[in-house]
């Protein structure tokens, strides 16, 4: 894991339990799904459903699996080589600038605007001006028309792991 690691990502203290599989490092690195021993001689497997590693590494521990928050659905579980993939529930979305929570999609566009994009797990409905066709930033909507939208079906899963 060459990326910056924050301490919140880390798994609880691990000592190599007898059931954890061991293998030898290759050029000082252990394969995905493993971490290295203190002396650098062994690769110790991560614990399925508890922690993981995605890259060849020389870390002393595997990374803690993400737990999906309430308001999220689990698209795929945590394995020893891949973190949990969580996605916002239908009718909610997660913005890049506020990734910590799922927000409710707007039910309709402000007056004078028309909906051109559905609510997806990673974006709010998209509105454009009827005349100019320019996008609406989607901040605080003005008085809403009765144009409403049903939550859109995601085109593809949005992985927010790592």
């Amino acid at each position: 894991e060459s990326a910056l690691i924050t301490q919140q990502d880390l798994a609880p203290q691990q000592r190599a339990a007898p059931q954890q599989k061991r293998s030898s490092p290759s050029e000082g690195l252990c394969p995905p799904g493993h971490h290295i021993s203190e002396d650098g001689r062994d690769c110790i497997s991560c614990k399925y459903g508890q922690d993981y590693s995605t890259h060849w590494n020389d870390l002393l521990f595997c990374l803690r699996c993400t737990r999906c928050d309430s308001g999220e659905v689990e698209l795929s579980p945590c394995t020893t080589t891949r973190n949990t993939v969580c996605q916002c529930e239908e009718g909610t979305f997660r913005e890049e600038d506020s990734p910590e929570m799922c927000r409710k999609c707007r039910t309709g566009c402000p007056r004078g605007m028309v909906k051109v994009g559905d609510c997806t797990p990673w974006s709010d409905i998209e509105c454009v001006h009827k005349e100019s066709g320019t996008k609406h930033s989607g901040e605080v909507p003005a008085v809403e028309e009765t144009v409403t939208s049903s939550p859109g079906t995601p085109a593809s899963p949005c992985s927010l792991s790592g």
């Epitope: 880390l10 021993s37 203190e38 650098g40 020389d58 002393l60």
Partner: nanobody
Framework: EVQLLESGGGEVQPGGSLRLSCAAS????????MGWFRQAPGKEREFVSA????????FYAESVKGRFTISRDNAKNTVYLQMSSLRAEDTAVYYC????????????????WGQGTLVTV
Amino acid sequence: EVQLLESGGGEVQPGGSLRLSCAASGLTFPNYGMGWFRQAPGKEREFVSAIYWSGGTVFYAESVKGRFTISRDNAKNTVYLQMSSLRAEDTAVYYCAVTIRGAATQTWKYDYWGQGTLVTV
């Protein structure tokens, strides 16, 4: 925020002893190593010794084996370097550092560093 505070440096006669301490705070990693490095004037920083928190695995540079002893106090989150039979070539600024990598004897494997303490023999 991880902080490392070294102490115990000073001036000593050849053949004498010193004990360096490094107190760590802000560490919540499940396991980590604490190492000592040294840097003499005009020279590169070099590895001296390291100890790991969970299993207590230790490493020493060949130049200090048999003279220096590294130990740890888990309750105090402190690592010690007992230096004996000191020589003129041991004169350097001694740095404490923390790693989350195994078998870490290279500077680039260490993520956090203290300010250093001067040892003059």
